[in-house]
């Protein structure tokens, strides 16, 4: 899977959208490595 910063950001945005935003406060692009997906 793509692990550039931009890919990570878009993947996280999709995850947040699907979860209704119900995720931990520190679940942000700069804290989340690609392996978290």
């Amino acid at each position: 899977a793509c692990d550039t910063a931009t890919c990570v950001t878009h993947r996280l945005a999709g995850l947040l959208s699907r979860s209704g935003g119900v995720v931990k406060n520190n679940f942000v692009p700069t804290n989340v490595g690609s392996k978290a997906f």
Partner: antibody, heavy 119, light 107 residues
Framework: EVQLVQSGAEVKKPGASVKVSCKAS????????MNWVRQAPGQRLEWIGD????????NYNQKFKGRATLTVDKSASTAYMELSSLRSEDTAVYYC????????????WGQGTTVTVSS | DIQMTQSPSSLSASVGDRVTITCKAS??????VAWFQQKPGKSPKALIY???YRYSGVPSRFSGSGSGTDFTLTISSLQPEDFATYYC?????????FGGGTKVEIK
């Protein structure tokens, strides 16, 4: 309102260095990567690199590695791009850009900083 | 580096026309492609990410498609404010790279 406000135009001599700033507001600066892109007159956009403001970690376009340095001042929510050993081909508009998720999912760009390299 | 080749480099069209711009990557970039609009003297404005998703606030007449190496930006009915230069970008691999741009001019 998310804003990326860049420093003003610069005129430099060949061999000199320039440092462009990008002040972020309206979102949590350390949550999102900051990209730097340039555009020479009449040319395509060219990616310089990105920085993780949370850790200071960077990725550089090899073309600029060794000449470009990306840094941040977290307390001032400001990102910096320094380019050294300037040559005439570095004359361009330099942009900072960041993809933000909260409060609005969008790819925000600064207004651009014109850097002119001329003897 | 991945080369992004855009075509055409320029086109003339009228208000109401359907406009299609293509972008070809030199290797597979999955769907990790964005499209930008730029007007003279202005910063690029993001339109599309992940090949086919519109950012909030982008009019529905803009649509993107493609995966792998071939991508398309379509403007279904060209409006006066759409005359600009359009760029594709791949962000699948470092360094991110942009296409050469397509200038959409008034016929």
């Amino acid at each position: 309102e998310v804003q990326l406000v860049q420093s003003g135009a610069e005129v430099k001599k060949p061999g000199a260095s320039v440092k462009v700033s990008c002040k972020a507001s309206g979102y949590t600066f350390t949550d999102y990567y900051m990209n730097w892109v340039r555009q020479a007159p009449g040319q395509r956009l060219e990616w310089i690199g990105d920085i993780n403001p949370n850790t200071g970690g960077t990725n550089y376009n090899q073309k600029f590695k060794g000449r470009a340095t990306l840094t941040v001042d977290k307390s001032a929510s400001t990102a910096y791009m320094e380019l050294s050993s300037l040559r005439s081909e570095d004359t361009a508009v330099y942009y900072c850009a960041s993809i933000i998720i909260v409060p609005n999912y969008f790819d925000y760009w600064g207004q651009g900083t014109t850097v002119t390299v001329s003897s | 580096d991945i080369q992004m080749t855009q075509s055409p480099s320029s086109l003339s069209a009228s208000v109401g026309d359907r406009v299609t711009i293509t972008c070809k990557a030199s290797q597979n970039v999955d769907t990790n492609v964005a499209w930008f609009q730029q007007k003279p003297g202005k910063s690029p404005k993001a339109l599309i990410y992940s090949a086919s998703y519109r950012y909030s606030g982008v009019p529905s007449r803009f649509s993107g498609s493609g995966s792998g190496t071939d991508f398309t930006l379509t403007i279904s009915s060209l409006q006066p404010e759409d005359f600009a230069t359009y760029y594709c970008q791949q962000y699948n691999n470092y360094p991110y790279t942009f296409g050469g741009g397509t200038k959409v001019e008034i016929k």
